[in-house]
């Protein structure tokens, strides 16, 4: 019961977490204008991983897509490629996770199968989270990078004959989705391993002779029964019969009450 | 890079007018947004008017509305403010400033004149 709550729990984590990575990645305030002493009061600016937008203080809001892949920053190319990979991960991972929840039955799936595919997803999901996080992470990291470089321009570009100046970025709001999101899907991913150990009893092998009284009905051979974790063949903990040792009369005889242990 | 160059500055008497230009080289200002700014003496640097890349949407600051209009002419690369009943207050250096609006994945770039001084005096 513990098992499935834990399995159950991981997989809803996840799927929450995979929601917010996919909102996150579609957002457009990853960055945002630092209000702070900044003297562009007209027009507010903020950027996503795939358009600028631009809102006036009439309210009017314009956004523009980045039609182009030369044109862009590495850094921006490798969060968005991070990004992706996690919510393609995520994706798969929770298409995996579906099929291997203990309160679903599909045909014949055996316990193995489903600690396998529970493993599997939570391995997913887990690398998933770290995508993003990372992604994130570095987006963040060229903000602040930015942050000071612009904040140096402010000072030292005011007496050229070219007065640049770069408006100062800020965190935006996708920013703090894709980590909490990220988060959730990593802490997914964990309870999804740890589901799968209990999902997956330890294979103990041990040998059963069976004893019986009535004469010579079935011979049996010694190790007949096997307890397993459906990692192996015998899967049933059916008897395994030795059918080449029959005398003539054994081909007549019926089982007794007695032949099975 | 925008070049930009002010002019149209000078000595004005209170409730007169003044028409300040900023002319921008380098690259058209077509998908700039255009601001002009002051200062006055010993203060800092005050946001005076706005006007969008197309010529819209144009902002005012308080102190100036109903006084000051911004105009543009993107065929002339061209940015205008034209001042009218000029007060004391309005004594300052008036800069135009460029503001890179759709920045590819990176923060925009603002591009500043040198200034051009008015001054209000009876």
């Known amino acids: 019961m513990a098992v499935t709550a834990c399995q159950g729990l991981g997989f809803v984590v996840s799927l929450i977490g995979i929601a917010g990575i996919i909102a996150a990645t579609c957002m457009d305030q990853w960055s945002t204008q630092d209000l702070y002493n900044n003297p562009v009061t007209a027009v507010f600016n903020y950027q996503g991983l795939w358009r600028s937008c631009v809102r006036e203080s009439s309210g009017f809001t314009e956004c523009r897509g980045y039609f182009t892949l030369l044109g862009l920053p590495a850094m921006l190319q490798a969060v968005r490629a991070l990004m992706i990979v996690g919510i393609v991960l995520g994706a798969i991972g929770l298409l995996v996770s579906i099929f291997a929840l203990k309160c679903i039955r599909i045909g014949s799936m055996e316990d193995s199968a489903k600690a396998n595919m529970t493993l599997t997803s939570g391995i997913m999901f887990i690398v998933s989270g770290l995508c993003a996080i990372a992604g994130v992470s570095v987006f963040a990291n060229m903000l602040v990078t930015n942050f000071w470089m612009s904040t140096a321009n402010m000072y030292t570009g005011m007496g050229g004959m070219v007065q640049t100046v770069q408006t100062r970025y800020t965190f935006g709001a996708a920013l703090f989705v894709g980590w909490v999101a990220g988060g959730l899907t990593l802490i997914g991913g964990v309870m999804m391993c740890i589901a799968c150990r209990g999902l997956a009893p330890e294979e103990t092998n041990y040998k059963a002779v069976s004893y019986h009284a009535s004469g010579h009905s079935v011979a049996y051979k010694p190790g007949g029964f096997k307890a397993s974790t459906g990692f192996g063949s015998n899967t049933k903990n059916k008897k395994i019969y030795d059918g080449g040792a029959r005398t003539e009369d054994e081909v007549q005889s019926y089982p007794s009450k007695h032949d099975y242990v | 890079q925008v070049q930009l160059v002010e002019s149209g500055g000078g000595v004005v008497q209170p409730g007169g007018s003044l028409r300040l230009s900023c002319a921008a080289s380098?690259?058209?200002?077509?998908?700039?947004?255009t601001n002009w700014y002051r200062q006055a003496p010993g203060k800092g640097r005050e946001f005076v008017a706005f006007i969008n890349y197309r010529g819209g949407g144009a902002t005012y600051a308080d102190s100036v509305k109903d006084r000051f209009t911004i105009s543009r002419d993107n065929s002339k690369n061209t940015l205008y403010l034209q001042m009218n009943s000029l007060r004391a207050e309005d004594t300052a250096v008036y800069y135009c400033?460029?503001?890179?609006?759709?920045?590819?994945?990176?923060?925009?770039?603002?591009?500043w004149g040198q200034g051009t001084l008015v001054t209000v005096s009876s």
């Open positions: 400033a460029a503001h890179e609006r759709f920045p590819m994945g990176r923060p925009p770039y603002d591009y």
């Open positions: 380098g690259r058209a200002i077509g998908t700039y947004d």
